[in-house]
């Protein structure tokens, strides 16, 4: 076809951004391009073209009219992780093509099983007490907090330090006795460890 004066090659006017999304949730990688004639948009992940509903109506990925890639739900298994990776959108017309910036799609996970559950501790009044837990594997890395007898632990108490998976009470009081649970939290949700009992004995 003859080159028309008003025609121009594609340019990306909205680039996709990095995403962290929970498994099973919907997500959108945005892409918008200008050009005349209107460019076609394709998506690539790790150099391979991404199949969408345009290729297979049963696909969980949809190419929106805007050019954005919409995931009905993020699919992510123990082994197969088809949605995770680095994406680019490519806009094409007969005058050329434009490639977006890279956008990484990471899947947030939080496993069920604590790598280390806290153990029961018995101390005398005034002695230090330490409980330790390792939360389930997760991405983003889960933050750790503690509950005592079902309520969040008051970490404003200067005797109490939470560092990594360690709960340290510098000198114990009788009132510190109770049932403690380690809580691992990220954007997926929270997981609670098994209960550990702190027993504080009178001297």
């Amino acid at each position: 076809s003859r080159l028309r004066q008003e025609d121009f090659p594609p340019r990306i006017v909205e680039h996709p951004s990095d995403l962290i999304v929970s498994k099973g949730e919907p997500a959108t990688l945005n892409c918008k391009a200008e050009g005349r004639p209107t460019p076609t948009i394709e998506w690539y992940k790790g150099g391979e073209r991404v199949e969408t509903d345009k290729d297979d109506p049963r696909s969980h990925r949809m190419l929106l009219p805007s050019g954005s890639l919409f995931f009905l739900r993020i699919v992510h298994g123990r082994r197969s992780k088809p949605d995770e990776g680095v994406y680019v959108c490519v806009a094409r017309n007969y005058l050329g093509e434009a490639v977006s910036h890279n956008a990484s799609l990471e899947v947030a996970i939080l496993r069920d099983d604590f790598r280390q559950n806290p153990s029961d501790v018995m101390v005398a009044v005034g002695e230090p007490a330490v409980m330790e837990c390792q939360p389930p594997r997760g991405h983003p890395e889960p933050t750790i907090s503690w509950k005592k007898d079902g309520s969040p632990l008051d970490d404003k108490d200067e005797r109490i330090t939470i560092r990594g998976g360690k709960l340290m009470i510098t000198y114990t009081r009788k009132s510190d006795a109770g049932k403690y649970v380690c809580v691992g939290t990220n954007m997926v949700g929270e997981r609670e460890s098994e209960v550990a009992e702190l027993t504080v004995l009178e001297r």
Partner: antibody
Framework: EVQLVQSGAEVKKPGASVKVSCKAS????????MHWVRQAPGQGLEWMGW????????EFPQKFQGRVTMTRDTSITTAYMELSRLRSDDTAVYYC???????????WGQGTMVTVSS | DIQMTQSPSSLSASVGDRVTITCRAS??????LNWYQQKPGKAPKLLIY???SLQSGVPSRFSGSGSGTDFTLTISSLQPEDFATYYC???????FGGGTKVEIK
């Protein structure tokens, strides 16, 4: 259409090797693990191992370690399973199967009959 | 390895019957269990994944339940096309149960 197409039937002598191919189409080949499952005549399904097409990593149950090799060619979106030192009890239909992101084998090849006979 | 024990190994039933097949894992596998249907000369077909999720395109008369070590596949009203062999599979170590053949009574 998402599909797996396997190579044709093979007849082999005991002690020989067989290499079965599995051509994937309609999906991103490197996004899904590929497994091999076999079924002896009149018997149940037996998992033989997996390959991660993204990096070529493999894992096999102890029964097949040292005798099975799984490879892939990403340029032609094809996975291969080679079984060596064949015995008559290796006579079976061999399937490739894609593992979905839901941890299940959602797409299967049509199967390849391998007969081991002297 | 986690072993999967399926029962019964075979059963006879009539069209319209409610059919239940059980699968037991030798240790807890949470909800990592799948069910497949296989007809003679054909590749297996995924019915249920993650213990209770129905695979797209599978009739709603099929359902799965259970978690931990004990799982069930139920066909609420057996149809002529349901006569086949059914396999459970745990997706932690990927091994299959021995299969249950559903035959016409």
């Amino acid at each position: 259409e998402v599909q797996l197409v396997q190579s044709g039937a093979e007849v082999k002598k005991p002690g020989a090797s067989v290499k079965v191919s599995c051509k994937a189409s309609g999906y991103t080949f490197t996004g899904y693990y590929m497994h091999w499952v076999r079924q002896a005549p009149g018997q149940g399904l037996e998992w033989m191992g997996w390959i991660n097409p993204k990096n070529g990593d493999t894992e096999f149950p102890q029964k097949f370690q040292g005798r099975v090799t799984m490879t892939r060619d990403t340029s032609i979106t094809t996975a291969y399973m080679e079984l060596s030192r064949l015995r008559s009890d290796d006579t079976a239909v061999y399937y490739c199967a894609r593992e979905s992101g839901d941890d299940a084998f959602d797409i299967w090849g049509q199967g390849t009959m391998v007969t081991v006979s002297s | 390895d986690i072993q999967m024990t399926q029962s019964p190994s075979s059963l006879s039933a009539s069209v319209g019957d409610r059919v239940t097949i059980t699968c037991r894992a030798s240790q807890s596998i949470s909800s990592y269990l799948n069910w497949y249907q296989q007809k003679p000369g054909k590749a297996p077909k995924l019915l249920i994944y993650a213990a209770s999720s129905l695979q797209s395109g599978v009739p709603s008369r099929f359902s799965g339940s259970g978690s931990g070590t004990d799982f069930t596949l139920t066909i609420s009203s057996l149809q002529p096309e349901d006569f086949a062999t059914y396999y459970c599979q745990q997706s932690v170590g990927l091994f299959f149960g021995g299969g249950t053949k559903v035959e016409i009574k």
